[in-house]
């Protein structure tokens, strides 16, 4: 029989962790069998930032510095896994680390609030409620987000007003609307390290309605009213 | 084969959300990234952002920071990119690229969805 | 991030000439880790998505015929295509696959003179 190299399980092993992990934190780990069925020893080669350590046995790869992101995400470095004992023949994969920003996705409306309206003309100051969301990991505490107006030529119409870390109230400030379409900017910071910010659109239509519904010409769809 | 077949084209206003769909097949959906790039008119490529199906892990560009969403769905294969916000220079031809074998370049290109922002 | 250059912005070769296309990154794309450098090129013809040529600046994608070649390390890059046929009038592309986040050159036109 002729001896074989180990095989890995995989030609890439793909590992994310967040960028102020702690050291020592076992951030990935790669596994190979031996076509014998000799045991192997892991090793890693062209980790030039001084960045890993890996588990000869067990493959397991930990952190042994602070990883910086600015460095340049993926960190690549190439894992051998040598038979032990035997023709000692060796094979390489590759470990590739993908560092992730501490708060990674920016702030969202968490629906689709196409198809709001009030009725023209406003016989009193107006609102609607709107939620948001994102989807980073929030493992302690929910969402806490802050609302403001998109741009400062809004804040002649209209006033956002937070409820509570996820839901934010957006009113007019007058009743002199036109018989339109106005696309509301808000702006959202999720307070995160480091804060991300999100601007998010509201269309709100001020039209005519007929029995509590925004009058429309045979075809189109009635919106959602709110008020 | 691998193929990745996006959703049509669109007409949107200004400030207004466009969802753009890509429906992938002949490959295991969660081994691979999944990038969205896009082309201007007469322009050049410009990528927006990817997401790893495996475990819903987005990276965007930093310019689309806020106004962009990837999301994906295990069940139908297919991953979504959403854009808000929309302005007129945000009219372009939308490409899904399904990252290559161990590595990120783009190795399968969608046919593109061409969205219109005008008033 | 990294910035990728293309030169030139157009050329125009003679059917079975040789076209190089040239591009330079910002950052070095060689990688002292895995011993790659992380850079692709792509071919856009009129009407259709881009089609990838090379990756890992000099491995061919499968299909991709041997008149395309790509060379290089660290900066600075070059596409090849050693003899032209009418069907190589498109605009190439290279990107970097180095670091996040992935970024392009402007592109080259090439053309038949």
């Known amino acids: 029989d002729v001896n074989e190299a180990p095989q890995f399980s995989q030609h890439v092993f793909q590992a994310k962790v967040s960028e102020d992990v702690a050291i020592g934190t076992k951030v990935g780990n790669v596994t190979a069998k031996d076509p014998e069925g000799l045991d192997i020893s892991y090793s890693l080669r062209g980790d030039t930032r001084g960045w890993l350590k890996i588990d000869h046995v067990t493959g397991e790869i930990f952190s042994v510095a602070p990883l910086d992101r600015e460095a340049g995400s993926p960190y690549r470095v190439q894992v051998v896994a040598t038979e032990v004992g035997g023709s000692s023949l060796s094979s390489v994969s590759e470990f590739h680390l993908i560092l992730m920003d501490v708060n990674d996705n920016p702030p969202r409306l968490a629906k689709d609030y196409t198809g709001l309206f009030f009725c023209h003309p406003l016989s009193a100051p107006g609102s609607l409620i709107f939620e948001a969301t994102d989807d980073d990991q929030h493992l302690f505490r929910g969402p806490h987000f802050t609302f403001s107006l998109g741009s400062g030529s809004l804040q002649n119409d209209w006033e956002v007003s937070k409820i509570n870390g996820t839901h934010a109230r957006l009113s007019t400030r007058h009743t002199e609307f036109e018989e339109r379409e106005y696309v509301v900017l808000i702006r959202i910071n999720d307070g995160g390290r480091p804060p991300l910010e999100g601007i998010v659109s509201l269309p709100v239509t001020f039209c005519s309605c007929v029995e509590g519904s925004c009058f429309r010409p045979a075809g189109h769809k009635h919106h959602h009213h709110h008020h | 084969q691998v193929q990745l077949v996006q959703s049509g084209a669109e007409v949107k206003k200004p400030g207004a959300s466009v969802k753009v769909s890509c429906k992938a097949s002949?490959?295991?959906?969660?081994?691979?990234?999944m990038n969205w790039v896009r082309q201007a008119p007469g322009q050049g490529l410009e990528w927006m952002g990817a997401?790893?199906?495996?475990?819903?892990?987005?990276n965007y560009a930093q310019k689309f920071q806020g106004r962009v969403t990837m999301t994906r769905d295990t069940s139908t294969s297919t991953v979504y990119m959403e854009l808000s916000s929309l302005r007129s220079e945000d009219t372009a031809v939308y490409y899904c690229?399904?990252?290559?074998?161990?590595?990120?370049?783009?190795?399968?290109w969608g046919q593109g969805t061409l969205v219109t922002v005008s008033s | 991030d990294i910035v990728m250059t293309q030169s030139p912005d157009s050329l125009a070769v003679s059917l079975g000439e040789r076209a190089t296309i040239n591009c330079k990154s910002s950052q070095n794309l060689l990688s002292s880790g895995t011993q790659k450098n992380y850079l692709a090129w792509y071919q856009q013809k009129p009407g259709q998505s881009p089609k990838p040529l090379i990756y890992?600046?000099?491995t061919r994608e499968s299909g991709v015929p041997d008149r395309f070649s790509g060379s290089g390390s660290g900066t600075d890059f070059t596409l090849t295509i050693s003899s032209l046929q009418a069907e190589d009038v498109a605009v190439y592309y290279c990107?970097?696959?180095?670091?996040?986040?992935?970024?392009f050159g402007g592109g080259t036109k090439v053309e038949i003179k």
């Open positions: 002949g490959y295991t959906f969660t081994d691979y990234w």
């Open positions: 690229a399904r990252g290559g074998y161990g590595d990120y370049w783009f190795a399968n």
């Open positions: 890992f600046a000099s």
């Open positions: 997401i790893d199906p495996s475990d819903r892990y987005t």
């Open positions: 990107q970097q696959h180095h670091y996040f986040p992935w970024t």
